[in-house]
Amino acid sequence: RTRSGSQLDGGLVLFSHRGTLDGGFRFRLSDGEHTSPGHFFRVTAQKQVLLSLKGSQTLTVCPGSVQPLSSQTLRASSSAGTDPQLLLYRVVRGPQLGRLFHAQQDSTGEALVNFTQAEVYAGNILYEHEMPPEPFWEAHDTLELQLSSPPARDVAATLAVAVSFEAACPQRPSHLWKNKGLWVPEGQRARITVAALDASNLLASVPSPQRSEHDVLFQVTQFPSRGQLLVSEEPLHAGQPHFLQSQLAAGQLVYAHGGGGTQQDGFHFRAHLQGPAGASVAGPQTSEAFAITVRDVNERPPQPQASVPLRLTRGSRAPISRAQLSVVDPDSAPGEIEYEVQRAPHNGFLSLVGGGLGPVTRFTQADVDSGRLAFVANGSSVAGIFQLSMSDGASPPLPMSLAVDILPSAIEVQLRAPLEVPQALGRSSLSQQQLRVVSDREEPEAAYRLIQGPQYGHLLVGGRPTSAFSQFQIDQGEVVFAFTNSSSSHDHFRVLALARGVNASAVVNVTVRALLHVWAGGPWPQGATLRLDPTVLDAGELANRTDSVPRFRLLEGPRHGRVVRVPRARTEPGGSQLVEQFTQQDLEDGRLGLEVGRPEGRAPGPAGDSLTLELWAQGVPPAVASLDFATEPYNAARPYSVALLSVPEAARTEAGKPESSTPTGEPGPMASSPEPAVAKGGFLSFLEANMFS
């Protein structure tokens, strides 16, 4: 079969695998005039890795709550038994009724974009439902995900989220839209409105066109013991125990307290959906209690005091004091002032000394005053807020908040790479590759102070030397290292990083990146001398930029061979001079050779070697560069991509014909390819470069 280069370059030639995993095909290459000898193209097939998704792919969430995704919900696996850390989900379309976030990150941050199966297993991926303004009974949300784990093909997944009042919710004991209870002054009456009791979410289960003809029937199953319920001024009693949501909405339900004390009161009820004119209708129902708190008429409500945020390090425990939570209440003892956690952050929990290890949701001012209440920072080092409600038991609850700022226990300055300064520029901006602070998360607010400055340069911000800068300035590319002394190819400086009260130091290494074009090409023949010229090493651009002749100094290598100056006259090889320094001009004049040696003490075969050079030019710092090359035993049939000044003696002898030998110093027509073919055009060009002379 014949295939053209344009077909190859156009991606039209496909390899279809069948049979064993290792194999390939033989081919010849022809340009119409010349034909190369046979070649073998090796192909290794990998077993196809398949991703699969198990789990219900449905999540049931209580209204207004946070629910972790679990392995029951979302469980990915691969046929190759891939590590769950490497099974990555990308959120293609996020939730509409809430948000997805990571437990270890600030819950107020941006929506989650990626997460792993391992994070699902750890319970760190959370869905938070946000309560809408309009009542609902059941709502449905979807998340579109893409599961990927190269080399397997991506798998699309849809996670269905059901938010329902039907579900048993520990954090929301009522199945109604509102069941907040009532505060009534002793001996007085108070209207029970939909602000306190509202079953309109049951009505929301009916399609809106029919909703107006439906109602919710409340049947009082246990009446208040210290007062009376009235609907449109008519008392409710065992013989008349019903009222409707429509009556509640119209403000017709009243509780009248009978006086004689401030004990708690309330009533129990059943509520169910009712069809038009009282017909039966299938729909939700609930049995609940409505709390009524009777308030002393002379009661003065407690006054919350200003709160100082609690600061503690990650993984530690700190007591909550009056600085964080206190109230002024002249007619209540500290033990009577109760706090209830309405919403807790994800960075830890409150615990009571002697109250078990788990989180507490209720405590008193006495617990705070005695130092019994503590916060345990078991989450990530982020700020969080407790939403609390506080009451003295005689006044309506007041909202309060407690801010907790978790500081990292330690920070680390991540140095991913030394700072590389382009040789001709002599300056470079620092980035996150050089300086980035992490604790249990990234610390974008980090600040840096120079504690040991660079020897050969300065750090600049806005063009001025500086000894302090921020992560933000680094990220914006505003922090620049500039060489001021052109005598060293490297430098370093030490910084102290500070993030949220924790510090760490680090050394940033600076290296100069040589402005040098290096091209070793294919393997070079052992025992031969090849010409070092600008096709191999070229500092021409540096010469232009600095208006000088760049100088090279050999620092190291080659291990097997040497760099020599080639004499102009045709003399014996012994006339070659060992070189330790040379210039760009020497390269351009073709005056340099590299004698490629054979590795000693082992069988002939391919090997690797290198030259380490220091490159100098006027007005710029020096730079260290290396020329890495591969070597192989000389193959007379093989075209080499560099000019050969001589070939091994053995090769000349083996040829046996005088005309096949090439005098040293004068490249023969067959011994080299004066212009190395650089592969630019894909597969075909690669073949041309390596298989044709």
Epitope: A250, H272, Q274, P276, G278, A279, S280, V281
Partner: antibody
């Protein structure tokens, strides 16, 4: 106390229409559905339909569909039931009844309508 | 439509004796949403409108003497007068309020033997 007072007896010719009224008092008129039930002489009770005084929505028994119209006037707390194309078998006592939850808790005194040529 | 059938059509019971009236619905009137039977009993005396006795099959309306009781579930229901009094002479109707049309039974005439 709750009272439903109906209009007086009527005699109608076949093919004519009748309109019976039911005036409510003693409760919030718009809170409770009003139903119409009729009883032919010596016969049982027959449900005709309901009206929601709040919304004006109605629901009629299939048998009376197209012939019956129930309306209300919230300003006077009155419900009306009109039956057209009268026949002799429409001779009956017509009751309005206030429903509460899922039963007829209060009834009007009834209106006798006689259809005779 | 749900059809209500009462038995017997008429019943004569001695004063002080127990009277039992049955009512059968053509389909269940038990609501799944609140577990209530949407079945009511009414008493009608000559020249008067009907009067509610029992709702939800077994709950006595306020002011109704406790000799009246209702029982049953689903499709079969019973009204019992434990000790018949002279003022109980009337026609008794069962009625379903499960869905429209809210049908009545044909009535049972109760007399004194």
């Amino acid at each position: 106390q709750v009272q439903l007072v109906q209009s007086g007896a009527e005699v109608k010719r076949p093919g004519a229409s009748m309109k019976v009224s039911c005036k409510a008092s003693g409760y919030t008129f718009t809170n409770y559905y009003i139903h119409w039930v009729r009883q032919a002489p010596g016969q049982g009770l027959e449900w005709m339909g309901w009206i929601n005084p709040n919304s004006g929505a109605t629901n009629y028994a299939q048998k009376f569909q197209g012939r019956v119209t129930m309306t209300r006037d919230t300003s006077t707390s009155t419900v009306y039931m009109e039956l057209s194309s009268l026949r002799s078998e429409d001779t009956a006592v017509y009751y309005c009844a206030k429903s509460w939850v899922s039963w007829f808790a209060s009834w009007g005194q009834g209106t006798l309508v006689t259809v005779s040529s | 439509d749900i059809v209500m059938t009462q038995s017997p059509d008429s019943l004569a019971v001695s004063l002080g004796e127990r009277a039992t009236i049955n009512c059968k619905s053509s389909q269940s009137v038990l609501s799944s949403s609140n577990n209530k039977n949407y079945l009511n009993w009414y008493q009608q005396k000559p020249g008067q409108p009907p009067k509610l006795l029992i709702y939800w099959a077994s709950t006595r309306e306020s002011g109704v003497p406790d000799r009246f009781s209702g029982s049953g579930s689903g499709t079969d229901f019973t009204l019992t007068i434990s000790s018949l009094q002279a003022e109980d002479v009337a026609v008794y109707y069962c009625q379903q309020h499960f869905n429209t049309p809210f049908a009545f039974g044909q009535g049972t005439k109760l007399e004194i033997k």
